[in-house]
């Protein structure tokens, strides 16, 4: 099923791409290109008899196109508003700049202390899981070599089950690996929430009448940090998938060589163990630093906040994260409204359905209106 997150990511990536190109590109939005990218998401789904996906696609594309145009128009306006918000917040905090800076520093240290054990555990888990994967797969290579020595005559029959089992074992182990490693990202999210909430409460008395503005800035920080956690999750998943892609051909290679001569098979089996070791080791080397790098990114984001709220803040391009957050909120809201309507539609008569569709169109309009309403 196509998710709100996938749609929002396509839209945001497309918007970022345009924004990075010349200004004119933003003004002359190639609607067709965005439509194509969104339609591509549905391609696989529409093969099945799936009226839900088809209906969603029909309603989503116009909504997304309109939302995208609004995004481009509101970007500058939002930048101005965020700038003004920060100015007011900075003015309120200025007399206590040292205390506020110290508070953010304390909070940063706390966050590091909270995350360090998880980053260490992640590193250890990567090693442990990689080692386990290696231990689980190596015996297959050894067993097949033994079978090759003992059953030179009936190779096909003797080795095929082992080769098939190796393939299945690779899949199973990689899934297990993902299952063990990705939950760390969710743990990180919980710690982010706790830490930012503590920061909000300890800074609230300084902000006093600008508390809403402070909350808004901290929402932006939370969004960025959690986005990092999501990226960490995605990177771990992608690396595990890549490992699967690299291990699968090894099993395939053995299966392919079953039809060939014994010599080729012998060579293939002799190399199998080494290849397994090499791929698993490469995975371990690549993924081990992920937790540490994630922590560094969070520290950097917290430091940026300290700078933004400090007396000597430069021109911080912070509005884009608010724009993205708003886009994601709007797409989520569209999806939940659509799902609600979908479940209601199943029990509605035709006239009720038609009436509801009219209301739905009006609602879509409202959802697109004012992309980023800032608290004043």
């Amino acid at each position: 099923e196509v998710s709100a997150d996938q749609v929002a990511t396509v839209m945001w990536d497309y918007f970022s791409q345009l924004s990075n190109n010349a200004k004119e590109a933003v003004e002359h939005l190639q609607k067709s290109e965005l439509t194509q990218q969104l339609n591509a998401l549905f391609q696989d789904k529409l093969g099945e008899v799936n009226t839900y996906a088809g209906d969603l696609q029909k309603k989503l594309v116009p909504f997304a196109t309109e939302l995208h145009e609004r995004l481009a128009k509101d970007s500058e306006k939002l930048k101005e508003e965020i700038g003004k918000e920060l100015e007011e917040l900075r003015a309120r905090l200025l007399p206590h700049a040292n205390e506020v800076s110290q508070k953010i520093g304390d909070n940063l240290r706390e966050l590091q202390q909270r995350l360090e054990p998880y980053a260490d555990q992640l590193r250890t888990q990567v090693s442990t899981q990689a080692e386990q994967l290696r231990r689980q797969l190596t015996p297959y290579a050894q067993r097949m070599e033994r079978v090759l020595r003992e059953n030179a005559d009936s190779l096909q029959a003797s080795l095929r089950p082992h080769a098939d089992e190796l393939k299945a074992k690779i899949d199973q182990n990689v899934e297990e690996l993902k299952g063990r490693l990705t939950p760390y990202a969710d743990e990180f999210k919980v710690k982010i929430d706790q830490t930012v909430e503590e920061l909000r409460r300890s800074l609230a008395p300084y902000a006093q009448d600008t508390q809403e503005k402070l909350n808004h800035q901290l929402e932006g920080l939370t969004f960025q940090m959690k986005k990092n956690a999501e990226e960490l999750k995605a990177r771990i998943s992608a690396s595990a998938e890549e490992l699967r892609q690299r291990l699968a051909p090894l099993a395939e290679d053995v299966r392919g060589n079953l039809r060939g001569n014994t010599e080729g098979l012998q060579k293939s089996l002799a190399e199998l163990g080494g290849h397994l070791d090499q791929q698993v080791e490469e995975f371990r080397r690549r993924v081990e630093p992920y937790g540490e790098n994630f922590n560094k990114a969070l520290v950097q984001q917290m430091e940026q906040l300290r700078q933004k709220l400090g007396p000597h803040a430069g021109d911080v391009e912070g509005h884009l994260s608010f724009l993205e957050k708003d886009l994601r909120d709007k797409v989520n809201s569209f999806f939940s409204t659509f799902k609600e309507k979908e479940s209601q539609d199943k029990t509605l008569s035709l006239p009720e359905l038609e009436q509801q569709q009219e209301q739905q169109q009006e609602q879509q309009q409202e959802q697109v209106q004012m992309l980023a309403p800032l608290e004043s």
Partner: antibody, heavy 116, light 107 residues
């Protein structure tokens, strides 16, 4: 309705200590600083210090360091100020005041008399 | 610490008159200044903060102005309840300090 209710008047002997309190109601206690202010008879106002009720962080006027100790009890939304080693110079009305951009709410004041 | 010099120390005026009180900090406090009114035997009441912003519920006959090292509190059309003492206070870098006060009496 926001209210700061202070404890009653105190008559204490020189050298003793006293703890006066300020109970807050009608707002989120941990969301605002609480300050304490001294007003000697017929005189102006002097800021003693402030406390962040969320985490207990305190900031004192150098003049009152060692004389006043500020604490809070979050469970009862009450701020306390303890005054140590009292002398006749400490006789005054003491107020608690909420906020950081001027004190928008004040307690009714606690009169402290130090006399043998 | 920042010293706050308030003037005049006292003044007499009649109901309906307009009066202005001045406050001079010993250094630049930008716009971080508050004004209070205190009646005999009562707690002070916040009138203005950030030099010019009227606190909630304060009548519009009160107005604050100035920035840096010179600030003013102006009361138009004095009412009987306006008599008492007025204090300025900076809310810039701690420690916060108050002016010596201005006693406003009925003529």
């Amino acid at each position: 309705e926001v209210q700061l209710q202070q404890s009653g008047p105190e008559l204490v002997k020189p050298g003793a200590s006293v703890k006066i309190s300020c109970k807050a109601s009608g707002y989120s206690f941990i969301g605002y600083f609480m300050s304490w202010v001294k007003q000697s008879h017929g005189k102006s106002l002097e800021w003693i210090g402030r406390i962040n009720p969320y985490n207990g962080d305190t900031f004192y006027n150098q003049k009152f360091k060692g004389k006043a100790t500020l604490t809070v009890d979050k469970s009862s939304s009450t701020a306390h100020m303890e005054l140590l080693s009292l002398t006749s110079e400490d006789s005054a009305v003491y107020y608690c005041g909420r906020g950081i951009i001027g004190f928008d709410y004040w307690g009714q004041g606690t009169t402290l008399t130090v006399s043998s | 610490d920042i010293q706050m010099t308030q003037s005049p120390a006292s003044l007499s005026a009649s109901v309906g008159e307009t009066v202005t009180i001045t406050c001079r900090p010993s250094e630049n406090i930008h716009s971080y200044l508050a004004w209070y009114h205190q009646k005999q035997g009562k707690s002070p009441q916040l009138l203005v903060y950030d030099a010019t912003t009227l606190a909630e519920g304060v009548p519009s006959r009160f107005s604050g102005s100035g920035s840096g090292t010179q600030f003013f509190l102006k009361i138009n059309s004095l009412q009987p309840e306006d008599f008492g003492s007025y204090y300025c206070q900076h809310h810039y870098v701690s420690p916060w300090t108050f002016g010596g006060g201005t006693k406003l009496e009925i003529k």
